[in-house]
């Protein structure tokens, strides 16, 4: 479906005469009749198969035609058609003189015709006007024409119907060729399928309108890419819906059992060390000066006996205070006002004057220490035993009880595992960091060369002079069975043949 449009632009009839040559009185009041029909090689009268249209009187003799409605007519003239435009046409334009107001053909005298033109040719659908001018001996007509498609019709011959829509059945406008062009946010053959929110999971999400992301059961999140864990899952996640995979430190079906109470609750106070010891259970190892299940209680600072030289300790709000005995002073009663004359060194310590007798120093005998030799030495405090040895105080001395594999005063020597000659049958022993290794002689195997393996003593072909070799399996040695004329352990010596006898 489409419209053939004809735009009349100018008509020239300078002499104001009819086709017959007779002049019009008082002038030629001119109107037009248009006939559009199928292509004819020679345009002949007959039915206007594509349609007809008439104009009102547009002017007298010579005039230009305005391109709008004029006296109820229209310019351009419209010749609609309801078929596929064939691409070819024939056009007849007649100019008539109207003596009166009745313009019907039957009301006009036959000689009222001013001029008649006929053209034919090809015409493609398009927006561009084709300009033409037809001249006769007395008149000239300038006009232009085109074919355009009716609303909702598209394509080269206006045969393609496309009506834009934005409803349940589609969301599109029409392209010049009649193809659908989806509105933003829609896709599919008929633009019925919404384009979901960018990134919306293809399987787990869907949408009923553009830029939406609705989640299928078991999925959640803006893009429906997060699974919903099992109902009741406390400290767990999922990789597919309705799972519950426990986070680190949590156990139980619903990951609600705390396997790492220390990390999750930090129950130990005052810098104590926390150790997990089962579900919801922990142990605090307190720093010096603290006690209690959670090391929440501060021990009295006097409990560590900070006052020396017999000073007495008094707890205070901001710490403690040492009451020093006569002859001592300082924060911990560590300074002495005594001299060697006061015999301050205990346990047989020797006193040495210092600072011209204003002070002294005690030289303590073995097993005693302290500024006044008042403390017995615990010789194990410095952990002198190496390689995990246990330190034992033995009166004035100490000794180390070594772990297997170590020896020496301080367990500092590694016992050679090879000292016991553990390799049997002449195997060679090698000391290793974590034990020993035996390299076995031929015929023996096992960790300690204790397994006898049979060897073929005849493999080296020890027998000469075609002797037969036998292996003695009890001793892994060989025996040569000599041919006649040879002796020796390997049949290597020839025997002198006996003399020949005359008989």
């Amino acid at each position: 479906s489409g419209v053939f449009q004809l735009q009349l632009q100018e008509f020239i009839n300078e002499r104001g005469v009819l086709a017959s040559g007779r002049p019009c009185e008082p002038g030629c009041r001119t109107f037009f009749r248009v006939c559009l029909k199928h292509f004819q090689a020679v345009v002949s009268p007959g039915p206007c198969t594509f349609g007809t249209v008439s104009t009102p009187v547009l002017g007298t003799n010579s005039f230009a035609v305005r391109d709008d409605s004029s006296g109820g007519g229209r310019n351009p003239l419209q010749l609609p058609f309801n078929f596929t435009w064939p691409g070819t046409f024939s056009l007849i334009i007649e100019a008539w003189h109207a003596p009166g107001d009745d313009l019907r053909p039957e009301a006009l005298p036959p000689d009222a015709l001013i001029s008649k033109i006929a053209i034919q040719g090809s015409l493609a659908v398009g927006q561009n006007w084709l300009l033409d001018e037809q001249t006769s001996t007395l008149t000239r007509l300038r006009y232009s024409y085109r074919v355009i498609c009716s609303d909702n019709y598209y394509g080269d011959n206006c045969s393609r119907l496309c009506k834009k829509r934005n409803d349940h059945f589609g969301h599109y406008v029409c392209q010049p060729d009649g193809n659908l062009s989806c509105l933003p946010g829609w896709t599919g053959e008929y633009c019925q399928q919404p384009i979901c929110l960018s990134g919306c999971h293809e399987q787990n999400g869907y949408c009923s309108k553009p830029a939406e992301c609705l989640c299928r059961p078991g999925w959640q999140g803006r893009l429906c890419n997060e699974c919903i864990p099992h109902n009741g899952c406390r400290h767990g996640t999922c990789s597919t819906p309705w799972q519950c995979t426990c986070d680190e430190g949590w156990g139980g079906l619903f990951c609600d059992q705390d396997l790492n109470y220390c990390t999750h609750h930090s129950p130990c106070k005052n810098g104590a060390t926390c150790s997990n010891s089962g579900q919801r259970s922990y142990t605090c190892t307190c720093r010096p000066g603290y006690t209690g299940v959670d090391c929440e209680l501060e021990l009295s600072e006097c409990d560590s006996n900070p006052c020396r030289n017999g000073g007495s300790c008094k707890d205070q709000e901001d710490g403690y205070h040492c009451l020093c005995p006569p002859g001592y002073y300082g924060l911990h009663c560590e300074h002495s006002t005594l001299s060697c004359a006061d015999s301050p060194c205990f346990n047989g310590g020797s006193c040495r004057e210092r600072n011209q007798g204003a002070n002294y120093a005690c030289e303590c005998p073995p097993n005693f220490t302290g500024s006044n030799c008042e403390k017995k030495v615990d010789r194990c405090t410095s952990n002198p035993c190496a390689n995990g040895g246990q330190c034992l105080n033995r009166g004035p001395s100490r000794m180390c009880r070594c772990r297997p594999g170590f020896t020496g005063t301080y367990c500092e020597l590694h016992v050679s595992d090879c000292a016991r000659n553990p390799c049997a049958h002449g195997g060679t022993c090698h000391d290793l960091e974590n034990g020993l290794m035996c390299t076995c002689p031929a015929g023996f195997s096992g960790r300690r060369c204790e397994v006898r393996t049979s060897i073929d003593a005849c493999a080296s072909s020890p027998c000469f002079n075609r002797a037969t070799c036998y292996t003695d399996l009890s001793t892994d040695t060989f025996v040569c069975n000599c041919p006649y004329g040879f002796v020796g352990s390997r049949c290597e010596f020839p025997v002198g043949l006996p003399p020949s006898f005359p008989w």
Epitope: W242, Q243, C244, T245, C246, W250, G251, L253, F254
Partner: nanobody
């Protein structure tokens, strides 16, 4: 395909006993821990007991300790929940579940459940 099928539920009077079974298929039974949880109408599910793949580790929620016993028979690919001294508050749908690993840590697969009703 992993399948867990519960059976043994029913109606029992307070103080009575029931033995639930969970028959498993579709996986190497000895490799997975198996547990039981229950859900009463309008309430969140509650994990009540679980047994590790070896059977060496079991746990029970406080409300069933001393009354319920979980066990497994690896030869029959079955886990049992022996429920004694049942109370009305034990009424729920009981589900068998596995975390898909050897330890009792989470849920990967569940059965369809079996109804237990404790009522006089």
């Amino acid at each position: 395909e992993v399948q867990l099928v519960e059976s043994g539920g029913g109606l029992v009077q307070p103080g009575g006993s029931l033995r639930l079974s969970c028959a498993a298929s579709g996986f190497t039974f000895d490799d997975y821990a198996i547990g039981w949880f229950r859900q009463a109408p309008g309430k969140e599910p509650e994990g009540i007991s679980c047994i590790s793949s070896s059977g060496g580790i079991t746990y029970y929620t406080d409300s069933v300790k001393g009354r319920f016993t979980i066990s497994r028979d690896n030869a029959k690919n079955t886990v049992y929940l022996q429920m004694n001294s049942l109370k009305p508050e034990d009424t729920a749908v009981y589900y068998c579940a596995t975390p898909g690993i050897a330890a009792c840590r989470g849920i990967h697969y569940t059965g369809q459940g079996t109804q237990v009703t404790v009522s006089s």
